[in-house]
Interface confidence: low
Amino acid sequence: FNISGCSTKKLLWTYSTRSEEEFVLFCDLPEPQKSHFCHRNRLSPKQVPEHLPFMGSNDLSDVQWYQQPSNGDPLEDIRKSYPHIIQDKCTLHFLTPGVNNSGSYICRPKMIKSPYDVACCVKMILEVKPQTNASCEYSASHKQDLLLGSTGSISCPSLSCQSDAQSPAVTWYKNGKLLSVERSNRIVVDEVYDYHQGTYVCDYTQSDTVSSWTVRAVVQVRTIVGDTKLKPDILDPVEDTLEVELGKPLTISCKARFGFERVFNPVIKWYIKDSDLEWEVSVPEAKSIKSTLKDEIIERNIILEKVTQRDLRRKFVCFVQNSIGNTTQSVQLKEKRG
């Protein structure tokens, strides 16, 4: 199709070589074309937009994304040619940064419903470049944490070195939805709740004498509780003796609850004590069985193919540890009578 009629938007992605970050393009269809696809919803807070920004379509899977090769070849379907780019409804997600993402991206409705819709498309010229060392050394991260129950803020990485007074007007999105009241380079959250978690996008306009473009950054925000002050506790086994049948297989489970830590290095292992000897058992891998904001429950089993007389003289010890300290629970096997 002829892309000469598409509205054009220029975007800049300056990525940090020190960290992993993602990027998104929205299929921001133009205002004037009040067709099935190309109208912006003017909605009150009760009528939250049904779709990602500015889409009027009934079904966002009706949007098609293309890349325009620089050598003048025909448009390429994004889904077929670029595995590191994912189309999610009318948003294009770039999973890895790199200058090779630079180029022209076109989106348009799959179904053209009237003659006026032919030019209902957007061409986004994306320039991608690494952040220079001369740039701000302490720019905000693309992964930010908010402490639940406290006051916090989300900073726009590309503007975090500027004072609020110098900062241009910023457009913010959360999970693809426009946050219309936020215009500064920092969103201040009076009281952090778990629903403040999500993917935030901040845009601002930069101009030179020739043209203007949108500078965009993506921030993954996580809501967290404060680091635990407690060592892990063992939920199972509770008893220090376990009745068993000789010659039968046996699985003993160790379940431990670890409080939240930003830097989380949980240890859970089994070892066996036999008179003066002590050795660790290479048992199946530990697995997380429940994860919440506050804590994580991790389980690790020890498997005996069959219980022997020797096992009755041994102690099976579950050892768990976090950065605060460790806890152990030992189990002595006892032959079941009768």
Epitope: V48, E50, L60, G176, D190, K294
Partner: antibody
Amino acid sequence: SVEESGGRLVAPGTPLTLTCTVSGFSLNNYALSWVRQAPGKGLEYIGFINIIHGAYYASWAKGRFTISKTSTTVDLKITSPTTEDTATYFCARGPYYVGSEYVFDPWGPGTLVTVSS
Amino acid sequence: DVVMTQTPASVSTAVGGTVTIKCQASQSIGGSLAWYQQKPGQPPNLLIYSASNLASGVSSRFKGSRSGTEFTLTISDLECADAATYYCQCTYYDDSYDVPFGGGTEVVVK
């Protein structure tokens, strides 16, 4: 809009699945919640499902209900109904981000479930 | 878990009068409160969110306010159509994902 279906008279212990059909918005972008109301009583929240986080349940509802979804419907399965589960069951869009909080809107008209032997 | 205590259970007021319904949260929930109106045989309808913001299409006769953990819904210039049961709802999700509603207030218009 949202609309519930599947409510009927059911014997205690017989599993029952209610369906909420949505139109005009995508379940990819919104969560859908279930709330019930016993005859002459108040509103009781059961749980919600969304594409990102899966299903979440009120603490009292865990194990008693299962919420699942397709592209345009959300099901609520009452795993083993008792007479206390006799109620009108509503589905509602939400929670979603609006002014930094979660609300339920719109609601379906409700479907009546009667559990009796 | 948060508990929402709604008072009174029932109130009867003449047309043109004013009704005040209160909702007390057992702990701080910030401004995370919504009010719903439910008429007999109908589903609830959102009136107010974020304690004081009027939902789309709702008459300005409905007013929500907050003082600490106490929330108030005021209906002024009462009309016959306002006869309904009103529920408050804490809209903040804690880890348990319980979403507490108040017990409801029946408004009778004389």
